[in-house]
Amino acid sequence: MHHHHHHHHHHAAGLNDIFEAQKIEWHEAAIEGRSITGISPITEYLASLSTYNDQSITFALEDESYEIYVEDLKKDEKKDKVLLSYYESQHPSNESGDGVDGKMLMVTLSPTKDFWLHANNKEHSVELHKSEKPLPDQAFFVLHNMHSNCVSFECKTDPGVFIGVKDNHLALIKVDSSENLSTENILFKLSET
C-alpha cells in the first residue's frame, strides 16, 4: 500500500451550520411516535469519509457484490463521497451538541443511488445493501459530534454499538461507556473535498 498523506481542510463547521440553520417542521408522524424511516430528511450533505488517522473509506461496488476499504489514497486519486441524509429522532437526547433542541440527529449513508450502509448486529459488520424507502432501522445511525472535528455513528438498532475500523475494514464496535466514546477507531472526519 502506498502512503501518500496530503491534508485537506476538514469540513466540520458545516455540520453545526446545518444544525443551526435548519428550521424543522415536523410531520404528525413524529408526534405520534411512528418510525422516522418514512419521514423525509431535514437536509442532505455530500462528503468524503475518513478515519481519525486520515485514511479514506472507499467503496468497490458491483450489482451483486461489494467491498468497503479503509486505505491510504494515492495523491491524485479522488475521494469517494457518501450522501449523508439527516433525520431528527423523535426521542429526546440526553447528550448535548448532537442535535437540535435536545433531539438526536440520525443519518443514513449512501455511496451511490439506491445503496445504503446497513448495520448487521449479528455479524458485527457494516454492509452495503440495495434498499427501497422506507429504509430499515439498520440503515440509521445516531450522529455524535465528537472532539477534534470528528463524528461517530451509533447504530439505531443497537445503542452503544458504533461504526468503527477493524483490520482495515469497517465493523461494528461495542463501546462500553461514554468515557470510551473518544476511542480513535470509531471517530470519523467528514470533508467536502
Epitope: K74, T112, K113, F115
Partner: antibody, heavy 126, light 106 residues
Framework: EVQLLESGGGLVQPGGSLRLSCAAS????????MSWVRQAPGKGLEWVSA????????YYADSVKGRFTISRDNSKNTLYLQMNSLRAEDTAVYYC????????WGGGLRYPFGYWGQGTMVTVSS | LPVLTQPPSVSVSPGQKASITCSGE??????AAWYQQKPGQSPILVIY???KRPSGIPERFSGSNSGNTATLTISGTQDMDEADYYC?????????FGGGTKVTVL
C-alpha cells in the same frame, strides 16, 4: 453474464458520419459509466470518450472533441457514439467498455475498464 | 496529459519471469491498470489499482507502481501469456493508455 455488443461500423468517406451502438445486458446499465476505446489497425489502444451512468456528464479525447458525441439510452440499455466529420485517422476498431464498478456520488472517471465488447470496425476512406 | 511509455517488446522463456514497465511523470501518484490483448480478441483487464487482480486472473500476474514507473510482472510465464499488454491511467477524467508491449514466449 455481462455482455456488450457493438454495431454500426462500416466504410464511410472522409467528412461523412456514422453512428455506433453498444447493446448492454447482464447488469444494471444505468449504474455504470461507459466508454468508447478505439484501436487503429496494427496500433495500440486509444480512449475516445466516456459518459456517466445517468448520461449527465460526458468526456472526450482532444482528438475527437467537437466531432464525436457520446450518449446513452438507459431505457434501452444502449450506448451510442455519433461520429461526424470523419477523417482517415479515425479508421479503427471501436470497442465499448464498462467501468469495473458502479459509479459513486463523487463522479468523475477513475475506474478501470472491467468489461469490453468485441468491437466494430470503422473504415474512413475515399 | 501524461505520456505513458512502454517497451515495444519483451521476450521471455517459458517458466521465466517477464517484467513490463510503464513510465510516466508522477506515475506513482495515480492508479495503474493493465490489459492483455491477444490477436483478434478484445482486451482483458489483468491488474487494476496497481496491484489487484480481477477474479479469474491467475496469480502469476502481479503489479507494482511507485515513482515514475508502473510494472506488470508475469512470474512463471506460460505460452498462453503471449499477447500485447497495455497500461492505463486516468488523468483529470481523461483516459490515457501506454503504447503497448508485445510479450513473446520463446
Amino acid at each position: 453474464e455481462v455482455q456488450l455488443l457493438e454495431s454500426g461500423g462500416g466504410l464511410v468517406q472522409p467528412g461523412g458520419s456514422l453512428r455506433l451502438s453498444c447493446a448492454a445486458s447482464g447488469f444494471t446499465f444505468s449504474s455504470y459509466a461507459m466508454s468508447w476505446v478505439r484501436q487503429a489497425p496494427g496500433k495500440g489502444l486509444e480512449w475516445v470518450s466516456a459518459i456517466s451512468g445517468s448520461g449527465g456528464s460526458t468526456y472526450y479525447a482532444d482528438s475527437v472533441k467537437g466531432r464525436f458525441t457520446i450518449s446513452r439510452d438507459n431505457s434501452k440499455n444502449t450506448l451510442y457514439l455519433q461520429m461526424n466529420s470523419l477523417r482517415a485517422e479515425d479508421t479503427a476498431v471501436y470497442y465499448c467498455a464498462r467501468d469495473l464498478w458502479i459509479q459513486l456520488w463523487g463522479g468523475g472517471l477513475r475506474y478501470p475498464f472491467g468489461y469490453w465488447g468485441q468491437g466494430t470496425m470503422v473504415t474512413v476512406s475515399s | 496529459l501524461p505520456v505513458l511509455t512502454q517497451p515495444p517488446s519483451v521476450s521471455v522463456s517459458p517458466g521465466q519471469k517477464a517484467s513490463i514497465t510503464c513510465s510516466g511523470e508522477r506515475m506513482g501518484d495515480k492508479y495503474a491498470a493493465w490489459y492483455q490483448q491477444k490477436p483478434g480478441q478484445s482486451p482483458i483487464l489483468v491488474i487494476y489499482q496497481d496491484t489487484k487482480r480481477p477474479s479469474g486472473i491467475p496469480e502469476r500476474f502481479s503489479g507494482s507502481n511507485s515513482g515514475n514507473t508502473a510494472t506488470l510482472t508475469i512470474s512463471g510465464t506460460q505460452d498462453m501469456d503471449e499477447a500485447d499488454y497495455y497500461c492505463q491511467v486516468w488523468d483529470s477524467s481523461t483516459g490515457v493508455f501506454g503504447g503497448g508491449t508485445k510479450v513473446t514466449v520463446l
